[in-house]
């Protein structure tokens, strides 16, 4: 509530706004009859410097002139850019207990003169928009700086707008609020920006433009697509544009794509036919416009139209495989399997599959539709059977794929040779083979088929397979390959009416098994011991078991045990050994071996043979 400058005045020379690097003199003068009562000679004027409301310096030592009791002049130097506050206070030295009294204050602004504005750019958004220009102001001046944008054109057209920059706002764009119309298309316009502050002024170079240079059309709107006769590959894209647009750019892509298809359309008048679309595919469409074929700017891209193209009937052929097993004395069960079409072949949502099993000679035909990718039927074991499958969507069905049902492993002469399986990495296996040696009919193709060596449902866990051309002798299998699981792999060689196959086991990664086989019984028959066991549970095998080892040693013996190594066969669960002495108690146990090493031992069993030894 105090009148801060009641006691005196503060003045600045040369001015309260100074260029960076300049010094200033600040004079503090007491008004008549103001000051310390009774003792004018005890008046002491001090000057305090504040930056951002924080006291940073007492300029007592910067006095350059002192009129005792009436005025003091202080020189200030090295002022930083921006505003600095100086406050003059009166200190009555005879009264040590009273704080100094404010006399008056002054703000000094340190800045620079404006640089000439550069890079002027003007735009008018749409035919009915207004001209707005932006520029680069150059270095910050730290002072309030006024900018004036002036436009001049034909027919004595002049227009100007102003704005200012200070420490709270920046002025580098102005909308003139005028509209340039297409009838001025050939006319030239000049704009200039002038900057002025307390330390100087500057002007930009004149910037000349035409209507076409600065008018950016509005992006097209109301985009839609019409598919001709519900076609999935042909459609007419339609949109609304400003009246003067002569050129459009269209871009479109499937939603999961990373590259756009680009099309330029001249005088399209809001309509363009697309002929290369993929059926049943989510697309994104965008359009941009230009007012002139050679000059002018493209509009921003329109908002995206996202839509799915209609379905078309499936193309391509299904990849079919089958499994057959004798079900009783005169019937066999045929399980057909097929792979789903990829989206570019399905060209729609597959509603069902049409399956046909036909006996060639008797013309018996079994037909059915299924939504699954497998189908099982029991048929007579006699006769030559063929199967076909086609996929159907709402627009139609694919051409049926045919396969002859032959005994897949029936012809030894067609069995591929030297089949091997090598683990390539964690999730694939390289299978190689040599062609059949004495095939009496040409190999049309190889099928590499694999199944996990784990119990599974025949229909719920279909086989995995790859079709290989007849001149290839290797396949990298990766579908559904998991580490630490053993797979049985079959390589089939197929001719027109016969099949031969060879099997091998393989894994993509292996560890030593978790445990050894469990010995369930030891029996003595005709001077031989038969060891019976249960196999290691599948999850504990951790890869393909190569062989089992049966160990034995005399009870309480510290000697190394003897061992017998047996090739692993899943169908085998007992083995004879014949080198044990009668009436000696032995301890027996078993281990299992994968390519990674040997398991810990299984359970121990004691046995004392009774019969005559070898």
């Amino acid at each position: 509530n105090i009148d801060v400058c009641k006691l005196g005045t503060v003045t600045v020379q040369p001015a309260p706004v100074i260029p960076l690097g300049s010094a200033a003199n600040i004079s503090c003068s007491l008004n008549p009859k103001q000051g310390c009562s009774h003792y004018p000679s005890s008046n002491e004027l001090i000057l305090l410097k504040f930056v951002n409301d924080v006291l940073v310096e007492n300029l007592h030592g910067k006095k350059v002139h002192d009129h005792t009791g009436h005025s003091s002049t202080f020189q200030v130097t090295n002022l930083s850019l921006g505003m600095t506050l100086f406050v003059c206070k009166l200190n009555c030295s005879n009264s040590q207990k009273k704080p100094p009294v404010p006399v008056c204050g002054v703000e000094i602004s340190v800045g620079v003169a404006p640089e000439p504005p550069q890079n002027i750019s003007c735009v008018q958004e749409g035919e009915n928009g207004t001209v707005a220009c932006s520029w680069n102001s150059g270095k910050v001046t730290y002072l309030k700086t006024n900018y004036t944008l002036q436009l001049s054109g034909p027919n004595n057209l002049t227009c100007q707008k102003q704005c200012f920059s200070d420490n709270r706002q920046n002025c580098n764009r102005l909308d003139l609020g005028i509209n340039l119309s297409p009838d001025l298309a050939e006319s030239r316009f000049i704009v200039r920006v002038t900057a002025i502050n307390d330390l100087g002024n500057s002007s930009s170079l004149p910037h000349t433009f035409t209507f076409l240079d600065i008018v950016i059309p509005l992006p097209p709107w109301d985009i839609r697509i019409n598919f001709l006769n519900a076609s999935g590959s042909r459609g007419t894209l339609q949109w609304e544009d400003e009246g003067q647009v002569v050129l459009n750019q269209l871009r479109y892509q499937p939603l999961n794509s990373t590259s756009w298809n680009m099309v330029n359309a001249t005088n399209a008048k809001g309509k363009y036919d697309l002929r290369d679309l993929r059926p049943f595919t989510e697309y994104e469409f965008q359009i941009s416009s230009k007012l002139h074929l050679s000059g002018g700017s493209w509009s921003n891209w329109s908002e995206s139209l996202r839509t799915r193209t209609p379905e078309e009937e499936p193309v391509g052929i299904l990849d079919i495989w089958y499994m057959k097993q004798d079900i009783d004395y005169d019937r066999q069960q045929i399980s057909l399997f097929w792979k789903s079409l990829n989206p570019s072949e399905a060209r729609g949502k597959i509603l069902h599959y049409q399956v046909t099993l036909q006996e060639v000679t008797k013309k018996t035909t079994l037909q059915n539709t299924t939504r699954h990718t497998s189908w099982t039927r029991v048929i007579p074991r006699t006769g030559a059977w063929t199967a076909s499958v086609s996929a159907a969507n709402s627009k139609g069905a694919s051409a049926p794929t045919h396969i002859n049902i032959v005994d897949l492993c029936g012809t030894g002469l067609l069995a591929p040779h030297q089949v091997s399986a090598k683990s390539e990495n964690m999730d694939n296996i390289l299978v190689t083979w040599q062609p059949p040696k004495k095939a009496d009919s040409a190999v049309r193709e190889y099928i590499v088929e694999w199944r996990a060596l784990q119990p599974g449902s025949i229909t719920k866990f279909p086989p995995h397979w790859l079709r290989i051309p007849p001149d290839n002798m290797s396949a990298l299998i990766s579908e559904n390959i998991k580490p630490y699981i053993c797979y049985e792999i079959r390589v089939h060689a197929l001719s027109e009416s016969q099949g031969g196959c060879s099997s091998i086991r393989g894994d993509s990664k292996h560890k030593a098994p978790v445990s050894g086989p469990h010995i369930t019984a030891i029996t003595e028959k005709k001077e031989r011991l038969f060891i019976s066991w249960t196999h290691i549970p599948f999850p504990e095998q951790r890869g393909c078991i190569l062989h089992y080892r049966i160990y034995w040693k005399e009870r309480d013996s510290t000697a190394q045990p003897e061992l017998c190594e047996i090739q692993y066969r899943r169908s085998q669960n007992s083995h004879p050994i014949s080198s044990l002495q009668p009436r000696v108690t032995y301890v027996l146990w078993m281990t299992a071996v994968t390519a990674a090493g040997e398991s810990p031992q299984g359970n121990e069993r004691e046995f004392c043979p009774q019969g005559k030894a070898n």
Epitope: L453, S457, T459, R570
Partner: nanobody, 119 residues
Amino acid sequence: QVQLQESGGGLVQPGGSLRLSCTASGSIFAIDDMYWYRQAPGKQREFVAYITATNSANYLDSVNGRFTISRDNAKNSVYLQMNSLKPEDTAVYYCNAKQIVGFQIDEYWGQGTQVTVSS
């Protein structure tokens, strides 16, 4: 191992009905494909019907339309509803389960239940 137990057989007049049941126990986590077979005196065992994991069923031609196979997964059971029975349906009926390990098919059989169709 998998154990299968049939029940529901008996003596029935021609044109009558019976419902056979088969309950599985043991390591049945991969048993999805279930079958009924039968063996008449002096004849070979023959397939009657099966049901797959996806409930797809198939029948011997001579029983198609009269017999219906179904399953109740919660009870680990499979059933054979036999209607319009004929004397030639007289046989021991066996429940069968198949599973595949690699390319080898493992089969499990029940003890059988006698069905006699006679007036």
